[in-house]
Every structure is written in C-alpha cells, then in structure tokens.
Interface confidence: low
C-alpha cells in the first residue's frame, strides 16, 4: 500500500471533508519543485517567490540578488538566461507558445556591469530560439527559420544561414514532426563545450504533406492553419548537419557533416548530436524502419576544415524484436577519455542497462544487470556514474539514484536514494552541479514531493530546498482516496496496477470502477508519484475505485513486455485492460454492472477500442483526443512500432486496427467522444472518422468538440472538459449529482 | 586522536527508562551518520540504530522500534540514544559508532561500551 | 534483511599459520562488506571495508577478497595479538546493518 501524507487524525471527523471538483480545477493541491540552475560546481541560481534573481553559492552559505524584480518586470520578462561569463542576462518576454517546446518570444540584454539593457544591434522580433554559448557571451538565434551569431550582445549579427522559410526549409530548430517525435526540443543547434564550433540542423520539408485546419478565431473568415506534416507512409523531412566555426565563421562557412553510408542508403532520420570536445562530435542516425540505429563519432580536420567520420568510429544498435531504443533511442554519456562511453541499451536477456563501450559495441561492458532496468544515466565523473533505476524492492514504478564508484574495481554501486525518507518519497530525478560537486534530489512521490540538496561527495543532505509545507498543511483536514500498487500475474505476463480507493473504502460493499488507461508504447502510468488529480476527486467524493493498469507495450519491466506490440498496435494493450477488468471483479467490491473506462490521446484510442471490444464488461467511457487509424498519425511515432503501411509491409493491421472497424460494437455502451478542433498533434481528423463510421453504423453516442483548442485542451476548456465527464460518468453509474 | 565515550549506562527495572550518551571529538560530527550498536553477554554484535548527520533519517533495528529513540546534538558533538520499556534482552554493553563517509558505510571508530543491565 | 553467515565459527590455529574466515550473504551484496576484530573487553575495530581495502593502520597480513555473496578474510602470518574474535558486517542494504555471528581465532 502507498502511504498518502499522514496527518493527525481529529476525533472530530467532520473537520475532515472530501475533494471537490473545483479543489482540482483551481490546483489547490499542486505542488512545487526546486531545480537548481547550476552555475558552477558550487552556485545556483533560484527565482525567488517575489521574482528576484539570486545567486547562491553552497560553500560560503551567502546568497545575492543579481537581477532585481524591478528590472524583470520593466520588460515584463517571464524567463531569464545567464551568460557563463556572467557579464549579460537575457530576459525574456512575450512568450507565445507554438507546439509541444516551441515558442516564439522577444528577447532584451541586461548589462550587469552597467546596470543597463544593451543598446544598439538589438535582436529582432519574435525569436524562435536564442541560447548563449558554453563559455564567454556569444550568442546564437533563430529568426524566421534562420541561425545568426553574435559574438558580443552589442555587436551586430553574423547570419549563418540563408535559405531559412516559414514551413519549407527550418535551420536551428525542428519542423512539427522532429519536434515532437525525434529530439523532443525546441532547438536543433548544439555548441561545443568552449564555444568554438555551433553544430546545427537543416530540415527541408519542401515535399512534406500538408495537414491544414481551420482556426475559427473571432473574425468574419477562419483562418487555415498550414503544418508540413508526414503522416505514415507519407514523404519525411529530409535532414542535414553543420557545423560552423564561430570564431572565423566566414573563413570557411557551415561544414556538412557526412551521413553513415549504412544509413544514408534509404530513408532515414537524425536522432541526436553529443558534442565530446571542441573538436570531437558523435551524431546519432536511425533508419527510417526504425530498428537500426548508428551513432558516429566525428573528428575535425584541422588540415581540410572538414568533419571525419571514420567507419571505425561508427557504432551500430540493432534490435531483432522490436525497434531501437525505447520511447528514443538512447543518449551517449562520454567518458573523459573522450571516445569510451555509457549508453543503455537491451541486453541479452532484454533489459535496458548501462554498457560500457570502447571500442566496439560488441565487446560491451555491462555496468548493471537484472531484471530491472537501468532508466536514465545522470552523470558520469572520473569515479562515479550516477543513473536511475526502478531496481529497489522490484517496483518497476519506482525511481532511485544510484551511485556506481567507477574509479575502483570492481566498480561498486551503492543506492543513493533507497532508505532517504523510505515511505514518502519512491520516485526521484536529480541535478547535479559542475563536476557532481553537488546535487540535488527531488522527490515526486508517493508522499508530498520535496526537494534536497546534497553533497556529491559523501552524498549528505545540506538542506531542505522546497518540502511543500502549505500544501501539507492544506491536506490536513482532506479525506484524500487511498493507494495501492500491487501486480495481477495473468499468463506469464505481469500486469502492475495502481488503484486508487475511496477513503472509507470497505472490501464487503460493491464500488463502481473507472479504468484510467494511456497504454502507448514505452509509457508507464503506474508509478509512485504524487496526485490530487481529478481521479483522486472521483474516489475520495464520489465513491468511484479508479485503477490504472500497465499492461503488454509499457515500459521499464523488460523487452518480452515492452516489443510485444511491435507491428500489432491495439490489440494486447486492450486485451490486458479487459483482462485487468476481470480480475478486479473477482476482487469482490466491484460493482459489474457499473464499470467504465476512460484515455486521452493513445489512451483514447485504448479506451474506444475497449468500449468496442464486445465483451460487455463495460457501461460506458470516454474518448478525449484518440488516435482512431494509424494512418492519420505521424510517421515518426507510427511507423517506429507498426512499420509502413504498404501492401508489401503491415497496411493489412493499419486496416485492421482502427475504431472505425468497429463501429457496430459501440451499439451496447454509452460513448463520449471528445477532441479539440485545433489539435495539431492528433488531428480532428480521427474523432471526425469516428463519428461518421458511428453515424453510418447508426448507432447513437455523446459527442463534444473545443473550437480551437489544441491536443491539450487548456485554460477554461479544462475546467469544461471534467466537468462535462464528471456529469457523464455519474449519469452513467447512477450517482445523484 | 578521534575519540567517542559513551555514558549514561547501569542498572535498570523492567519497563525503565535510561538515556546514553556519546561525546565525539577530533572530528566534523556533524557529517557522519553515527550508530548505536550493542553486545549482549557472550553473544554477537547487534546494530540498534542509526542516525543521518543533519538527523533527517532515523533508523532502528525491528526489536526497539517505539521504544528506542536515537538523536544527536551537532552543536554539541553529542549523539544519544534514549531506551524506554526496557526488557530483559535488552541487557547488553552499548557502543556508538561513526561510520565512513559514502560510499562504505563502515564503522571505522567506535566508543569503549556502556553497560546497560536491565533485570528486576 | 540480509543475512550473514560466517564459518567456520572457531578456528584453532598456531602462531604463524595462515588463517581463512568465511563470510556469505544471503544476497549479493555487491562489495560492501566489512571486517571486524574484537578482543575481551574491547570495542570492535575495522580491519577491512569495501571487501578488500584495509583500514588505517591495519598489517598487511590481514586481506579481504570477494564481491556478491562469498567473501573471504586471510591473515597471512598468525601473530599472537590476532586471537581474537571476528566479525564480518554488510552494509549494501540498510537499515537494519547486519553482522554475521562471528568467527573465533583461537590459539591451538
């Protein structure tokens, strides 16, 4: 059982009240992190509550003000970046979001040694993209699709690239599809680590599909939304790299760094770039059939000005039963060798560990092995390697930090995390400073979320950075639901499951169910994290059992369960759900003839095809954005588990695999399809397919749209969305309102 | 030298109290997790407790959980183990420890023992 | 909790005989194990941690080895002032530390 924050019980027990709807729509229990912006191996930066700047340095315990609340708000400045050589800060305002990382700002230059905003050669209006460089104050942008440098904030621009055009050729930063499915940034240019090299990349979606949409606005005509986006099967971006010497970028202008030949034979993307020094880079490659990735590490030829990829320095990652990587393909951690490495990938029992790699990757090290997975690796020093893992007690929904002593041998790992603050907090990430002098942990869960720092040597805690006092205090008097983490074995197969109980939940009385379900591929919603979400509000008022379940194609327990879904999207992740479903009934306090299930995005799709599985088990449940065909989503996520849909490949399970197939099976339950008109991630396309293949079926279901919203459904649209569900699942199990 | 001196032992009812102490010196208590760890006569050694250098966790062994509460005074250089409900099995010469910094954990200096006699 | 158990659980031996003590664990336990000496009447001190690296001021006639579950103590040469009892101690997983039940060194 996951203990919730425990509290003083009050023999008066109406002093305790359950959660309402608006306690979840005002996030009047949210919580809050503390990530340190580290400065150096011993400094950080914090905004404080009253939105100062303030530099704090660990060892001399004493912190300052660097940039007043007063300059911020001059500029109406939301975010800020310092330049390392701590000369220039750059403010940032006007944000205005684009996709899922993209957004345009404006950008000013706050001189601290003068106390004044640079003035001539300012930067022009909006910016895509600007960062600093590693060492001193250069700085890159993007503006309007092209890279331009500055050497100085006052000095004027040096453009890099030309050919830069809204939807047609992007430098710098991703088009829709990179974005969202490949790097999972906002930028696509990387300094080397002194600042003498920017490496960036070109995508050219000139021959890209276009999927256009109407944006309603408020004007007399609606405006078309135009996005070059590759649908599965359909043309990708085609993408290269340069790198450009910042110092003299004239002298020889952007070097193209040359594709692995192995890769560049057919279509393929570029999935990542890790500089090693200023004059070693390693980029990461990957078949467009996604189960073949190669990493190549490049030298600068000093004598030519070009970029040398040896084939001896090309390191190959297959899989032979699924797709590369995980949700990516993972990242390179350098060692400071410069040319050995860390890296996760699947061992030969299939699981996802540390290996070592020196020379090739056949003759792998594995640093760590079990039936567990290694999740993310933090940081490498000359004697430590710091990684996550969900190793501890055989949770795989858990996170601890981990310690590997690299320097001595056999290396020696300790758990950094396992007994700090045991039942409270189970799942950590870290941020370490320069040199993991120091680190901090924060802590999301199962208790109330908090945040420490750490000495990197001896791994002490120094202090309390962030431990959400208010929101303990706010709890007290709250009937929050009950947790459990437990696991079903159904025929080999294991199937995690977290369910979240009514406060005065009692195993003798009958509860109806709502199923929460995500399910795609590499995701995991059983996890010992922190909620006060709007399931917790449907257990602790109005009485509903709310289980998640982590069933075949999630991630962390292995590749038998991870690549089980490979070409065959939709089929296990619902069967498990419904086999979940029978397995609570038998629990004995679930009502049968009240059950629901309800997903968003891919856990629409998982939702709907549930609904729609014939089975019976199900009263009603909701869809909010679905996928309803493989066909209508990007090639990037699509193609990487269901391979290309042509005759010769996998269209027959494209075909088989959509809701619409099975249009008739809605008949016997009472459905809500909801989607946003503006959805540029999952088209309105499906839900559109979805209500014409109901409609053709005549069969009857509950629809709703959000004119203009995008695949998040944000602002007031929120506060809409669950109370509209929150009225349809209690119509549904008969709960008075 | 690094030195650590227990006190606070002796001779005990049943189902009495008694508090022990350890005074350090000659090094920085306050970044140490320091233990308690006890000998009964003729028998093995038995870890009781332990405790973070910025007391942020507390450990005890299964047998003195609710009864033993473990602290430290790092203005003072001073750990303690205050021991209620004391049994019969309880009987056992005490001796606090410093353990190494991370990663080993090993107890690199320990006290010369109390004594703690419980019997009626 | 994991378990230690050492053997034998006493050893008769001479001045200047070699003496190996055994210590396994219940689970492996990576290389954090460690050594102790007690003598009549004395605390316990720490030859060896890390499963191999001696402490300060500890004779080189005393060694550790092993990683996982099996772990060994080797005093090269017996002198008199190394009768005494031994205990070895895992601290991998934590709490509760767990030592093993001790070994006796004594002269034969």
């Known amino acids: 059982i996951v203990l919730r924050p425990s509290r003083v019980h009050n023999s008066e027990e109406n002093t305790m009240r359950a959660l309402t709807l608006k306690d979840i729509l005002n996030g009047t229990f949210s919580y809050k992190t503390f990530f340190p912006n580290w400065i150096s191996g011993q400094e950080y930066l914090h905004q404080s509550a009253d939105n100062n700047i303030v530099l704090y340095n660990i060892e001399t315990g004493q912190s300052y003000t660097i940039l007043s609340n007063r300059t911020m708000k001059s500029v109406n400045a939301s975010n800020y970046g310092l330049s390392p050589d701590r000369q220039f800060v750059y403010l940032e305002s006007d944000y205005s979001k684009l996709w899922r990382y993209s957004y345009t700002a404006t950008y000013y230059i706050y001189d601290l040694s003068n106390g004044e905003f640079v003035r001539g050669n300012e930067l022009p209006r909006p910016i895509q993209y600007l960062c600093w460089s590693p060492v001193g104050s250069k700085l890159a942008y993007v503006y309007q699709n092209n890279i331009y440098l500055k050497q100085r904030p006052g000095d004027p621009p040096f453009q890099i690239t030309f050919n830069g055009r809204e939807n047609k050729i992007f430098n710098g930063i991703p088009d829709w599809v990179y974005e969202e499915e490949m790097l999972a940034t906002k930028y696509a240019l990387w300094w080397s680590p002194n600042g003498k090299f920017l490496a960036y990349a070109e995508f050219n979606d000139t021959d890209i599909p276009v999927i256009a949409y109407s944006y309603y606005g408020d004007e007399q005509y609606p405006r078309t939304i135009n996005i070059p986006y590759p649908k599965a099967g359909a043309k990708n971006p085609v993408v290269r790299i340069f790198i450009i010497d910042t110092t003299y970028p004239a002298y020889v202008g952007p070097q193209e760094v040359p594709v692995p030949a192995m890769i560049a034979s057919s279509d393929y993307y570029f999935s990542w770039l890790t500089w090693v020094t200023d004059e070693r880079v390693c980029l990461q490659w990957l078949k467009r059939v996604q189960n073949v990735s190669v990493l190549s590490i490049c030298d600068f030829r000093e004598d030519w000005q070009t970029w040398d990829c040896p084939k001896t320095q090309e390191h190959i990652e297959e899989s032979r039963t699924g797709w590369a990587g995980g949700f990516f393909v993972s990242t390179p951690v350098f060692s400071y060798d410069a040319i050995s490495y860390y890296k996760i990938f699947s061992d030969k029992d299939g699981y996802k560990h540390i290996h070592y790699i020196k020379d090739t990757v056949e003759n792998a090290i594995q640093i760590t092995s079990g039936k567990w997975e290694a999740i993310n690796i933090f940081r490498v020093t000359q004697d430590s390697l710091f990684y996550s893992s969900n190793e501890f007690e055989e949770y795989p929904g858990r996170r601890n930090i981990y310690r590997i002593s690299i320097g001595s041998y056999p290396p020696s790992k300790k758990c950094v995390t396992c007994h700090l603050r045991k039942e409270r907090c189970q799942y950590y990430t870290a941020s370490f400073s320069d040199y993991a002098k120091y680190y901090a942990l924060v802590c999301y869960g199962p208790g109330i979320p908090i945040s420490t720092l750490h000495d990197g040597r001896t791994d002490q805690e120094i202090k309390i950075l962030e431990e959400n006092k208010e929101l303990e205090n706010a709890l007290k008097n709250i009937q929050l639901p009950k947790e459990e983490i437990k696991k079903l074995e159904v025929d080999e197969i294991t199937l995690w499951y977290k369910m979240i109980l009514p406060p005065q939940f009692d195993r003798s009385k009958k509860y109806p169910l709502l199923i929460q379900v995500y399910g795609g591929p590499c995701s995991q919603s059983v996890r010992s994290v922190f909620a006060v979400n709007w399931i917790s509000y449907l257990a602790s008022k109005e009485g509903m059992v709310i289980a998640l379940v982590d069933g075949r194609g999630t991630a962390f327990q292995g590749d038998k369960l991870l690549y089980a879904v490979y070409r065959k999207l939709g089929v296990y992740e619902v069967e498990d759900q419904i086999t979940a479903v029978r397995k609570f009934i038998e629990m004995g306090f679930i009502d049968e003839k009240r059950i629901a299930i309800w997903g968003w995005s891919y856990g629409g799709y998982v939702s709907s095809l549930a609904l729609a599985s014939g089975t019976g088990l199900f009263k009603c449940g909701i869809a909010v954005a679905p996928v309803s065909s493989w066909e209508y989503y990007a090639s990037v996520y699509t193609e990487r588990f269901m391979g290309l849909p042509t005759k010769d490949d996998n269209l027959e399970h494209y075909k088989n695999s959509t809701v619409m197939a099975r249009a008739e099976y809605f008949r016997n339950v009472d459905y809500l399809l909801i989607h946003g008109t503006a959805d540029d991630n999952v088209h309105f396309q499906n839900s559109a397919q979805i209500a014409k293949a109901l409609v053709n079926a005549q069969v009857d279901f509950q629809a709703m749209w959000y004119s203009d919203q995008n695949h998040g459904l944000s602002g007031l649209s929120t506060n809409h969305l669950y109370t509209h569900m929150t009225h349809f699942l209690k119509q549904c199990f008969s709960l008075s309102d | 030298d690094v030195q650590l001196v227990e006190s606070g032992g002796g001779l005990v009812h049943p189902g009495g109290s008694l508090r022990l102490s350890c005074a350090a010196s000659t090094f920085t208590f306050a970044n140490y997790i320091m233990s308690w760890v006890r000998q009964a006569p003729g028998k093995g050694l038995e870890w009781v407790s332990g405790?973070?250098?910025?007391?942020?966790?507390?450990y005890y062994t299964d047998s003195v959980k609710g009864r033993f509460t473990i602290s430290r005074d790092n203005s003072k250089n001073t750990l303690y183990l205050e021991m209620n409900s004391l049994r019969a099995e309880d009987t056992a010469v005490y001796y606090c420890?410093?353990?190494?910094?991370?990663?080993?954990?090993?107890?690199?200096?320990w006290g010369q023992g109390t004594t703690v006699t419980v019997s009626s | 909790e994991i378990v230690l158990t050492q053997s034998p659980g006493s050893l008769s031996l001479s001045p200047g005989e070699r003496a190996t003590l055994s210590c396994r664990a219940s689970?492996?336990?990576?290389?954090?194990l460690a050594w102790y000496q007690q003598k009549p009447g004395q605390a316990p001190r720490l030859l060896i941690y890390g499963a191999s690296t001696r402490a300060t001021d500890i004779p080189d006639r005393f060694s550790g080895s092993g990683s996982g579950t099996e772990f060994t103590l080797t005093i090269s040469s017996l002198q008199s002032e190394d009768f005494a009892v031994y205990y070895c101690?895992?601290?991998?997983?934590?709490?509760?530390?767990?030592f093993g039940g001790g070994t006796k060194v004594e002269i034969k």
């Open positions: 420890a410093k353990h190494q910094l991370y990663p080993y954990y090993a107890m690199d200096v």
């Open positions: 689970q492996p336990i990576d290389s954090y």
């Open positions: 405790i973070t250098g910025s007391s942020t966790n507390t």
């Open positions: 101690q895992q601290y991998y997983d934590w709490p509760p530390v767990t």
